[in-house]
C-alpha cells in the first residue's frame, strides 16, 4: 500500500531573467527512494538517481542546475517557462509518486532575481 | 582509450555459478562511472544484468536478482560477475560496459567485446 | 519493467536509401532513450543519447528523434557499413530495457 505524499512548493512565480528553486519532499513513507525525475510538461529536464548522481537533460544544460538536495534550479527564466513542472519519485518498493508545481514567470518590474509565489502544498500518490 | 575486456570460463555446467570478469584499462575504476553487465542470449536482444557504481553499491535487474552479485576488485581495475543456480536460459554473450551517467544518461559508451558462456552439462 | 518493442524487426533497403526504424515504450519516457548500433559478432556502439543527441564522432546521417512513447531511428543515406542491428534502450526508470532490435541489410 502507498502511503506517501509528495509536499511541493505549489504555485510560484519568479521575474523574467531571474532563477528558482523547484523543490519537493517525500514523507509518510519509509520506502527507498532510487530516482527522482524532474520534467516540464512532456521534457525531461533531469534525473538524479540515488546512486549514480545528476543527468542533466542536453537542452537544458546551460540553464538548469542540480539540487539543492533532490530539488532543481531553473535559472535566467524566460516567460516560455511558464507551466507545469513535475517531480517524480520513484522507490521501492511503493512504486511512483507525483507532486506538481505550477510556475509563473512574470515581466520584469525593474528589480533582479526571483520572487517567490504562494506555497500551496499538493499530495499526489501513484503516477503509473 | 578506456577499453574493457571480458574474461571467464566459456562453459559452466547447470546449477553451477557462472564467474566473469572485466578488466578495465586507461581508466581507474576508482574515479568516476558505473560498471555495468549485459547479455545477449544467441540471435535475440539485449538483457541489463546489473550494475556496480565506483562507490560500491549495486543495483540489480529485479528478474536475475535473487542470483546476481556484482563487485569491484580495485586492487586488479576491474569487476565481476557472479550468477548462480545456471540453467541453458542462461548462455548468452555476457558483455561489460561503462555508464557516464552525468554526460549520457543511462546509456552505455564503452562496450567489452562480448564473451560467449554456454551452460551445458 | 518499461517494455521497448522495435518495428520492423529486419528490413532490406539500398545503399543512399533513408531507412527509418521505430521504437514504442510501454509507458512514456520522456526523451530518455539511446540507440546502439551491433555489427555481427561486435559490442553494441553507442550511436543516440537523450532521443535526439548524437554521440561524439557519430556521423551526421544518424539521427534520433521523438519524445513519450513513439521514437524514430533515421539513416538519412544508408551506407554498406551501416549493415548492422539497431537497438533502442530507455533510461526513464532505474531498471534499463532495451528493444528486441531491428536488423538491417542491403537489398
Known amino acids: 500500500m502507498m502511503t506517501g505524499t509528495i509536499e511541493t512548493t505549489g504555485n510560484i512565480s519568479a521575474e523574467k531573467g531571474g532563477s528558482i528553486i523547484l523543490q519537493c519532499h517525500l514523507s509518510s513513507t519509509t520506502a527507498q527512494v532510487t530516482q527522482v525525475n524532474w520534467e516540464q510538461q512532456d521534457q525531461l529536464l533531469a534525473i538524479c538517481n540515488a546512486d549514480l548522481g545528476w543527468h542533466i537533460s542536453p537542452s537544458f544544460k546551460d540553464r538548469v542546475a542540480p539540487g539543492p538536495g533532490l530539488g532543481l534550479t531553473l535559472q535566467s527564466l524566460t516567460v516560455n517557462d511558464t507551466g507545469e513542472y513535475f517531480c517524480i519519485y520513484h522507490t521501492y518498493p511503493d512504486g511512483t509518486y507525483t507532486g506538481r508545481i505550477f510556475l509563473e514567470v512574470l515581466e520584469s518590474s525593474g528589480g533582479g532575481g526571483a520572487g517567490g509565489g504562494g506555497h500551496h502544498h499538493h499530495h499526489h500518490h501513484h503516477h503509473h | 582509450q578506456v577499453q574493457l575486456q571480458e574474461s571467464g570460463p566459456g562453459l559452466v555446467k547447470p546449477s553451477e555459478t557462472l564467474s566473469l570478469t572485466c578488466a578495465v584499462y586507461?581508466?581507474?575504476?576508482?574515479?568516476?562511472?558505473?560498471w555495468h553487465w549485459i547479455r545477449q542470449p544467441p540471435g535475440k536482444g539485449l538483457e541489463w544484468i546489473g550494475y556496480?557504481?565506483?562507490?560500491?553499491?549495486?543495483n540489480y535487474n529485479p528478474s536475475l536478482k535473487s542470483r546476481v552479485t556484482i563487485s569491484v576488485d580495485t586492487s586488479k581495475n576491474q569487476f565481476s560477475l557472479k550468477l548462480s543456480s545456471v540453467t541453458a536460459a542462461d548462455t548468452a554473450v555476457y558483455y561489460c560496459?561503462?555508464?557516464?551517467?552525468?554526460?549520457?544518461?543511462?546509456?552505455?559508451?564503452?562496450w567489452g567485446q562480448g564473451t560467449l558462456v554456454t551452460v551445458s552439462s | 519493467d518499461i517494455q521497448m518493442t522495435q518495428s520492423p524487426s529486419s528490413l532490406s533497403a539500398s545503399v543512399g536509401d533513408r531507412v527509418t526504424i521505430t521504437c514504442k515504450a510501454s509507458?512514456?519516457?520522456?526523451?530518455?532513450v539511446a540507440w546502439y548500433q551491433q555489427k555481427p559478432g561486435k559490442a553494441p556502439k553507442l550511436l543516440i543519447y537523450?532521443?535526439?543527441y548524437r554521440y561524439t564522432g557519430v556521423p551526421s546521417r544518424f539521427s534520433g528523434s521523438g519524445s513519450g512513447t513513439d521514437f524514430t531511428f533515421t539513416i538519412s543515406s544508408l551506407q554498406p557499413e551501416d549493415i548492422a542491428t539497431y537497438y533502442c534502450?530507455?533510461?526513464?526508470?532505474?531498471?534499463?530495457?532495451f528493444g528486441g532490435g531491428t536488423k538491417l541489410e542491403i537489398k
Open positions: 560496459a561503462r555508464m557516464d551517467y552525468g554526460n549520457y544518461g543511462g546509456a552505455m559508451d564503452y
Open positions: 586507461g581508466y581507474s575504476i576508482t574515479s568516476g562511472y558505473s
Open positions: 556496480v557504481h565506483y562507490s560500491g553499491s549495486t
Open positions: 509507458q512514456d519516457v520522456r526523451t530518455a
Open positions: 537523450s532521443a535526439s
Open positions: 534502450q530507455q533510461y526513464y526508470s532505474t531498471q534499463w530495457t
